[in-house]
């Protein structure tokens, strides 16, 4: 595939990545799939600066990110190491709360109204953020 050198229309560039901010809500799995179909992934927060950038764009609204523990340990969707990486959980979170009455615990992470993270039921229809890296090979075939 060809190397992407600039962000698609309606995406925002920041530090060699492109971001797309939804204005509607989807369950985590549907949001994850949406980003994959755009040759991207749910946002992976790796630094103080990236947290601040995303926080500015989403405002005080619950928004999915690419972090989940549906298979046990917490994992970033792009393989970034969770244990050694940036974290910004709210106090007492994640708590895998079962008291919501929706069945199961809480396996998907989202930005809360103050930007800090919470785990929640993955079926909740929250906004989401897609991210794709510039300089990575896109899946589109090269033009002949």
């Amino acid at each position: 595939g060809s190397e992407r050198t600039c962000c698609p229309v309606n995406w925002v560039e920041h530090e060699r990545s492109c971001y797309w901010f939804s204005r509607s809500g989807k369950a985590w799995a549907d949001a994850d799939n949406y980003c994959r179909l755009e040759d991207a992934h749910l946002v992976v927060v790796t630094s103080w600066e990236e947290q601040k950038f995303v926080q500015h764009h989403i405002g005080p609204v619950n928004t999915w990110m690419g972090l989940h523990d549906q298979n046990g340990p917490w994992k970033w969707v792009d393989g970034t190491d969770y244990e050694t990486g940036f974290k910004n959980w709210r106090p007492e979170q994640p708590d895998d709360w079962y008291g919501h009455g929706l069945g199961g615990g809480e396996d998907c992470a989202h930005f809360t109204d103050d930007g800090r993270w919470n785990d929640d039921v993955c079926q909740r229809p929250y906004r989401w953020v897609c991210e794709t890296e510039l300089d990575k090979a896109s899946q589109e075939p090269p033009l002949l």
Epitope: W48, E49, Q51, K52, F53, H56, F86, K87, N88, W89, P91, D114, G115
Partner: antibody, heavy 118, light 107 residues
Framework: QVQLVESGGGVVQPGRSLRLSCAAS????????MHWVRQAPGKGLEWVAI????????YYADSVKGRFTISRDNSKNTLYLQMSSLRAEDTAVYYC???????????WGQGTTVTVSS | DIQMTQSPSSLSASVGDRVTIACRAS??????LNWYQQKPGKAPKFLIY???SLQSGVPSRFSGSGSGTDFTLTISSLQPEDFAIYYC?????????FGGGTKVEIK
């Protein structure tokens, strides 16, 4: 009321170590990130370090990286700054401050003075 | 590192004057800028966060504005207790950095 009280300052020789403490009261200490900020005599404010509420992230100023360590004991409502390989330029009033939203500092202690001199 | 530059470094004003202090960042910090007030021998006091939000308990004569790289702190009608040093601080990127300060003195 919300209060931060620093202690542990004093006169120390270059190359030696010192540990500062900051005792918090009047708020849920374990829910807030905490900072150390310093001010050299007659100079402006210089940020030193921050630690997350749960200790999951720590960041340092370049001038102290590798020499200073920020830590906390939430069971004791206390913040610490371990300072080693001290230099004359580390002479300052050291303040602890409560974090507001990754970087803002809404509550400050009264400061403790560190003097590095032979 | 992001450099924060304040101007002027000092100013003389009278009670009742409108005072404006500028703060410029060496790169875009969006709106991640705070203002503090410090009086001699005292700890700094938090005034304004995210460029324009007034901290609880701070008098409404204080206001902040700006985004990107240029920011302003305004005191609409200077009071005797406002004579102090004012610092801006960026929180967009680590290391966190302060401006050099602006000393507001009595004319």
């Amino acid at each position: 009321q919300v209060q931060l009280v620093e202690s542990g300052g004093g006169v120390v020789q270059p190359g030696r170590s010192l540990r500062l403490s900051c005792a918090a009261s009047g708020f849920t200490f374990s829910s807030f990130g905490m900072h150390w900020v310093r001010q050299a005599p007659g100079k402006g404010l210089e940020w030193v370090a921050i630690i997350w509420h749960d200790g999951s992230n720590k960041y340092y100023a370049d001038s102290v990286k590798g020499r200073f360590t920020i830590s906390r004991d939430n069971s004791k409502n206390t913040l610490y700054l371990q300072m080693s390989s001290l230099r004359a330029e580390d002479t300052a009033v050291y303040y602890c401050a409560r974090d507001l939203s990754m970087g803002g500092m809404d509550v400050w202690g009264q400061g403790t003075t560190v003097t590095v001199s032979s | 590192d992001i450099q924060m530059t304040q101007s002027p470094s000092s100013l003389s004003a009278s009670v009742g004057d409108r005072v404006t202090i500028a703060c410029r960042a060496s790169q875009n910090i969006i709106s991640y800028l705070n203002w503090y007030q410090q009086k001699p021998g005292k700890a700094p006091k938090f005034l304004i966060y995210t460029a324009s939000s007034l901290q609880s308990g701070v008098p409404s004569r204080f206001s902040g504005s700006g985004s990107g790289t240029d920011f302003t702190l305004t005191i609409s009608s200077l009071q005797p207790e406002d004579f102090a040093i004012y610092y801006c601080q960026q929180t967009y990127s680590t290391p966190l950095t302060f401006g050099g300060g602006t000393k507001v003195e009595i004319k």
